[in-house]
Amino acid sequence: KAMHVAQPAVVLASSRGIASFVCEYASPGKATEVRVTVLRQADSQVTEVCAATYMMGNELTFLDDSICTGTSSGNQVNLTIQGLRAMDTGLYICKVELMYPPPYYLGIGNGTQIYVIDPEPCPDSD
């Protein structure tokens, strides 16, 4: 079987625009270097949201200006995306690449539909 990547079908972002989900993969080999990428698919366009490479047993580190944070535990990655607005609602796909040692493997999940609802502004008090 090909490398399977599992992620939840639906996640609702918090009122502060934060969404978290788990991306889990079944590794066909003993990878020591793994790259995890979050892709967003909307209107058939796919864009990269964020990406991080980690060494097995080490922490997942995204770039400082990334909207993503995450932790890893074995073949499971806990991803958090911040700063989401209603317009960011869409399908967020987890892509896992086993980079080292060779051979390279690619696994792509079916995606997590993240719904973001902008909070209602507080009504003015009379």
């Epitope: 079987k1 090909a2 490398m3 892709l39 796919v46 990269e48 892509k95 980079m99 080292y100 060779p102 051979p103 390279y104 493997y105 690619l106 792509i108």
Partner: antibody, heavy 110, light 103 residues
Framework: VVQPGRSLRLSCAAS????????MHWVRQAPGKGLEWVAV????????YYADSVKGRFTISRDNSKNTLYLQMNSLRAEDTAVYYC?????????????WGQGTLVTVSS | TQSPSSLSASVGDRVTITCRAS??????LNWYQQKPGKAPRVLIY???SLQGGVPSRFSGSGSGIDCTLTISSLQPEDFATYYC?????????FGPGTRVDIE
């Protein structure tokens, strides 16, 4: 034309896209035969993978400041005779080749 | 393995080419067309996604190990050689090709 056992370096000058953002490949095709994937290099040059038939003899490299991809071919054999294509991997799936060069014929013969 | 290795067909025919993988990787399968003396061009990527600019008569499908390329109504410009290729694991191997000739 190059003699068996000798070396040759192929270059591929890319234009029309952000070269530094894309993985790049070499694919070859022997006369009258099918396509054979040769090697890939990641956008930043950090990772390289090779076909078993060229491992240890060929080296893929790139210069992002010059938008150029290279293939250093050492210890050439008659079976390396082929048209060599450079190709771009897509940003989402590096193994999908969406733009190809016109190819250059390499003939290894004494 | 890719089958058939060659086929003869007429304009307007429906043509199906199959690529059988050793594992369930159809989602990571691409299809290319190559005409004599020309570089290949990608038609279908990720099993069923049509590359921009490719006519809609080309379609890809498959799940598990059997992946297919279908040309719904063969046109004169479609006579060429077709290759499948997997992008799941290195080496990114190509199938041996299917030559589509005029009957």
């Amino acid at each position: 034309v190059v003699q068996p056992g000798r070396s040759l370096r192929l270059s591929c000058a890319a234009s029309g896209f952000t070269f530094s953002s894309c993985g790049m490949h070499w694919v070859r095709q022997a006369p009258g035969k099918g396509l054979e994937w040769v090697a890939v290099i990641w956008s930043d040059g950090s990772h390289k993978y090779y076909a078993d038939s060229v491992k240890g003899r060929f080296t893929i490299s790139r210069d992002n400041s010059k938008n150029t991809l290279y293939l250093q071919m050492n210890s050439l054999r008659a079976e390396d005779t082929a048209v060599y294509y450079c190709a771009r991997g897509t940003m989402i799936v590096v193994g999908t080749l969406d733009y190809w060069g016109q190819g250059t014929l390499v003939t290894v013969s004494s | 393995t890719q089958s058939p290795s060659s086929l003869s067909a007429s304009v307007g025919d429906r043509v199906t080419i199959t690529c059988r993988a050793s594992q369930s990787i159809c989602n990571y399968l691409n299809w290319y067309q190559q005409k004599p003396g020309k570089a290949p061009r990608v038609l279908i990527y990720a099993a069923s996604s049509l590359q921009g600019g490719v006519p809609s008569r080309f379609s890809g499908s498959g799940s598990g190990i059997d992946c297919t390329l279908t040309i719904s109504s063969l046109q004169p410009e479609d006579f060429a050689t077709y290759y499948c290729q997997q992008s799941y694991i290195t080496p990114f191997t190509f199938g041996p090709g299917t030559r589509v000739d005029i009957e």
